[in-house]
């Protein structure tokens, strides 16, 4: 913490300018009025402060705004944003996409994923929902950031906005996020023709239920292995060998390469070896001929 001292008269600060770079930490602490700093935040980023000096300025703002900075200050944080912790950001109320853009630009190239995720969360809360303008800003300035949002936040995306999401924006999304986004995508794209529909829905399929995957297998979509491997294990397990063959089309040969990886490995274990042999890929590990399969999970559910 910076120790308190009295400001020498000749060092009194009346405006935020370049002369401050020659101030020692304790001089900045003693001589810079927090209200003046807040009022002239737009000047700070143009001044080549050291990281130590930025620490002092942040400390001044924290004292002035213990409940969180106003957006007028946040908008002009510039490189001071690099000093913010997720805990600091959680106190903010941000509604302006210009503020978001400015801070996303500053964070580029720095290890700030937690701060950026919290900032985006605050923007979504501040704006009330994840609207098209916010999604457009995220996809333009922070590819992959959409997946930093919690499923609860993603639930505020209107289906009409889903069309603005690009495949690369979903690369880092986990199953829980895709569970929220997939049904919205299915609603958003439901009026498209089969082939156009598949192109659009493909990045979201990690959230699809079995019945949708089965339906796709009837539509000659020739799903690529990368997409197949991202399907939910629970969605893949009930598929028959014939359904998987129809679903993958010419890509079915890729099953051999993924034989030891989930969900392919788990799916193989559920199939009859006879059926697997019909693929001619040498897949091993299926249920031997003559064995009886008892699905105890369904029996328990029925009892």
């Amino acid at each position: 913490d910076v120790e308190r001292t009295t400001c020498p008269p000749e060092k009194e600060v009346h405006e935020i300018d370049e002369s401050l770079i020659f101030y020692k930490k304790r001089e900045l602490e003693a001589c810079v009025d927090a209200a003046l700093l807040a009022a002239q935040m737009d000047r700070v980023d143009a001044i080549p402060f050291t990281y130590e000096q930025l620490d002092v300025l942040k400390h001044k703002l924290d004292e002035l705004y213990p409940q969180g900075y106003p957006e007028s200050v946040i908008r002009h944080l510039g490189h001071l944003f690099l000093k913010m912790s997720p805990e600091d950001i959680r106190k903010w109320n941000v509604t302006s996409l210009e503020t978001l853009k400015a801070l996303l630009k500053v964070s580029k190239g720095h290890e700030m994923s937690a701060q950026v995720a919290t900032l985006i969360d605050r923007v979504v809360v501040g704006r009330g929902q994840l609207d098209k303008d916010t999604v457009d800003t995220l996809t333009a300035f922070c590819p992959g950031c959409l997946c930093s949002l919690s499923p609860e936040r993603l639930s505020s995306v209107p289906p009409s906005v889903i069309g603005a999401v690009r495949p690369q924006d979903l690369d880092t999304c986990g199953p829980r996020q895709l569970d929220v986004l997939y049904p919205k995508a299915r609603l958003a794209f439901q009026n498209m023709s089969g082939s156009e529909y598949f192109v659009k829905i493909r990045p979201f399929l990690g959230g699809a239920p079995t019945e949708d995957v089965k339906a796709l297998s009837q539509q000659n979509v020739s799903m690529d292995l990368a997409t197949f491997m991202k399907l939910r294990r629970e969605a893949v397990l009930p598929l028959t060998v014939a359904e998987v063959q129809k679903l993958l089309g010419p890509h079915v040969e890729g099953l051999k390469v993924e034989e030891q990886h989930s969900p392919v490995r788990d799916w193989i274990l559920k199939q009859r070896q006879d059926d697997l042999d019909t693929l001619g890929l040498g897949l091993q590990g299926g249920i031997p001929n003559g064995y009886l399969i008892l699905d105890l999970s369904v029996r328990e559910a029925l009892s």
């Epitope: 499923p151 639930s155 289906p159 009409s160 199953p175 829980r176 569970d179 929220v180 049904p183 299915r186 609603l187 439901q190 009026n191 529909y197 829905i201 959230g207 239920p209 079995t210 019945e211 949708d212 089965k214 339906a215 796709l216 009837q218 539509q219 939910r232 629970e234 969605a235 009930p238 999970s297 369904v298 559910a301 029925l302």
Partner: antibody, heavy 122, light 107 residues
Framework: QVQLQESGPGLVKPSETLSLTCTVS????????WSWVRQPPGKGLEWIGY???????NSNPSLKSRVIISVDTSKNQFSLKLSSVTAADTAVYYC????????????????WGRGTLVTVSS | EIVMTQSPATLSVSPGERATLSCRAS??????LAWYQQKPGQAPRLLIY???TRATGIPARFSGSGSGTEFTLTISSLQSEDFAVYYC?????????FGQGTRLEIK
């Protein structure tokens, strides 16, 4: 074939929480989306919300602040909790299966439970 | 939300005759519309989806038409088991919404 059965108390006091469970038999809960729909006596149908087996939900904005839909895949069941009920929540509550097929692409219901009447009264 | 309005509220038709039920959406729902039949004390039963496609097991006398905001359910030759309440439902956007119903009664 798959069947749905609603269960829960038929009488709930005002300001309390209505709790219902839908049991899915004859098939896995994992394969579809599952909804709750209600119908006040002599009136039309109102969609309450859906749940996916993973726990992901979506509900009607008019009820959202009072609704919790949850799922128990081990029991092949999903549940509805509606808090702070009033007489206006008196209705037959149905659980229903959303078709869930891209080939027909839709959010409509091809299978329904028989419904259970819940009366809100002191 | 999209408001669905059905007309008429009650329709009286004689067995063997044709019945035409209407459903109007407050904004376009494209072809994302379903029709259900409900008899007293029973759950609704899916008749039509995609505005015009009959669900599995539904007799050919039931047909649906329309797109955008105007839709029609037609029952070509009424059988005694067809007298019931009919609901339309849009699934173009959430929340999913139903019409208030048309009661089809014997004349």
């Amino acid at each position: 074939q798959v069947q749905l059965q609603e269960s829960g108390p038929g009488l709930v006091k005002p300001s309390e929480t209505l709790s219902l469970t839908c049991t899915v038999s004859g098939g896995s809960i994992n394969n579809y989306y599952w909804s709750w729909v209600r119908q006040p006596p002599g009136k039309g149908l109102e969609w309450i919300g859906y749940i996916f087996y993973s726990g992901s939900t979506n509900s009607n904005p008019s009820l959202k602040s009072r609704v919790i839909i949850s799922v128990d895949t081990s029991k092949n069941q999903f549940s509805l909790k509606l808090s702070s009920v009033t007489a206006a929540d008196t209705a037959v509550y149905y659980c229903a299966r959303e078709v869930g097929r891209i080939a027909v692409a839709g959010w409509f219901f091809d299978l329904w439970g028989r419904g259970t009447l819940v009366t809100v009264s002191s | 939300e999209i408001v669905m309005t059905q007309s008429p509220a009650t329709l009286s038709v004689s067995p063997g005759e044709r019945a035409t039920l209407s459903c109007r959406a407050s904004q376009s729902v494209q072809s994302n519309l379903a029709w259900y039949q409900q008899k007293p004390g029973q759950a609704p039963r899916l008749l039509i989806y995609g505005a015009s496609t009959r669900a599995t097991g539904i007799p050919a006398r039931f047909s649906g038409s329309g797109s955008g905001t105007e839709f029609t359910l037609t029952i070509s030759s009424l059988q005694s088991e067809d007298f019931a309440v009919y609901y339309c439902q849009q699934y173009n956007n959430w929340p999913l919404t139903f019409g208030q119903g048309t009661r089809l009664e014997i004349k």
